[in-house]
């Protein structure tokens, strides 16, 4: 899987995609889980709704909502009042029956606010920063980086 | 072992710019960010910024923000930290710090050995 | 910015001595709080991180606890290598900041 990166601003929301196949995803709950050190395992931080009818629904733990169209093939997460300690490795998961397939693996930087004591004239987005000479723009708040690009840590 | 070696003492003009290096060993370099901390002259800590080696992404404190630039080349596993538009006031030893947190940030573990960076006319 | 105080300034003790210092935040960060010892003309040396996790290789005669706003260090059985400056930093909020520092010398 390639890895894409979310960057976000602390203290403001931020917005995850996942795409995927609604055909081969078809009838399957989904997962937002957080890589545990380099080799540990990835921790679930919410799931849809039990009721796979009802994954359009939108269900919170904490601060992380999650919110599937299923028709469409887009899982989104929100990370609501970003703090540092949400930087991390995570994985959008298909689940079927005690299994987990990866959907797709992100990379959530907490940028510091550029905005703080700063006029508003230097408006500023994640997506405009010049630091990701190895990646190509997704959208205006990640970039992908292709494996390959860059020697990606192993995961287990 | 986890290892971080920084450049040597360097010595500038105010008004000119710095590139301290940090090259890092024994771990896998992309999967932690590299902090750079200074301190001044009988001063504390200051926290200046990170880098997250394997993305490039970087943030750093309100302070330093459009001086500071920070980069690293993964090929060799180093990173480096260019302080520009130099003062007196930055004199100080420059420290990159390991994070010790899987591409996360779980406040750092290991410590170059410091790079002295004197700026004097 | 989260002001970081530490107290007291500067104490001194005996070796054997039981050493607390105290850090506190000017608002909650939770346990994002780290602990250094630094020796003169030296680089910091992580001890403790999350408020009360021994860095790996550090001795169990340090200790941290705390949340909140409130931390403490404790050096169980001062032993001559400790006398050293010890500061806390808060990893919760940016910009990440420092306390002052606590300087511990010889009695």
């Known amino acids: 899987h390639n890895t894409t990166v979310f960057q976000g601003v602390a203290g403001q929301s931020l917005q995850v995609s996942c795409p995927y196949d609604s055909m081969k995803h078809w009838g399957r709950r989904k997962a937002w889980c957080r890589q545990l050190g380099e080799k540990g395992p990835c921790q679930r931080v919410v799931s849809t709704h039990n009721l796979w009818l009802l994954s359009f629904l939108r269900r919170w733990n904490g601060s992380t909502a999650i919110t599937d169209d299923t028709l469409g093939g887009t899982l989104t997460i929100t990370l609501r009042n970003l703090q540092p300690h949400d930087a991390g490795l995570y994985q959008c998961q298909s689940l079927h029956g005690s299994e987990a397939d990866t959907l797709r693996k992100v990379l959530v930087e907490v940028l510091a606010d550029p905005l703080d004591h700063r006029d508003a004239g230097d408006l500023w987005f994640p997506g405009e920063s010049e630091s990701f000479e190895d990646a190509h723009v997704e959208h205006s708040i990640s970039r992908s980086l292709l494996e390959g690009e860059i020697p990606f840590p192993p995961t287990s | 072992q986890v290892q971080l070696v920084q450049s040597g003492a360097e010595v500038k003009k105010p008004g000119a710019s710095v590139k301290v290096s940090c090259k890092a060993s024994g771990y896998t370099f992309t999967g932690y960010y590299i902090h750079w901390v200074r301190q001044a002259p009988g001063l504390g800590l200051e926290w200046m910024g990170w880098?997250?080696?394997?993305?490039?992404?970087?943030t750093s404190a309100q302070k330093f923000q459009g001086r500071v630039t920070m980069t690293r080349d993964t090929s060799i596993s180093s990173a480096y930290m260019e302080l520009s538009r130099l003062r007196s006031d930055d004199t100080a030893v420059y420290y990159c710090a390991r994070d010790g947190g899987y591409l996360a940030l779980y406040g750092t573990d290991v410590w170059g050995q410091g790079t002295t960076v004197t700026v004097s006319s | 910015d989260i002001q970081m105080t530490q107290s007291p300034s500067s104490l001194s003790a005996s070796v054997g001595d039981r050493v607390t210092i105290t850090c506190r935040a000017s608002q909650g960060i939770s346990n994002y709080l780290a602990w250094f010892q630094q020796k003169p003309g030296k680089a910091p040396k992580s001890l403790i991180y999350?408020?009360?996790s021994l860095q790996s290789g550090v001795p169990s005669k340090f200790s941290g606890s705390g949340s909140g706003t409130d931390f403490t260090l404790t050096i169980s059985s001062l032993q001559p290598e400790d006398f050293a400056t010890y500061y806390c930093q808060q990893y919760s909020t940016y910009p990440f900041t420092f306390g002052p520092g606590t300087k511990v010398d010889i009695k």
């Open positions: 999350a408020a009360s």
């Open positions: 880098i997250n080696p394997y993305s490039g992404g970087t």
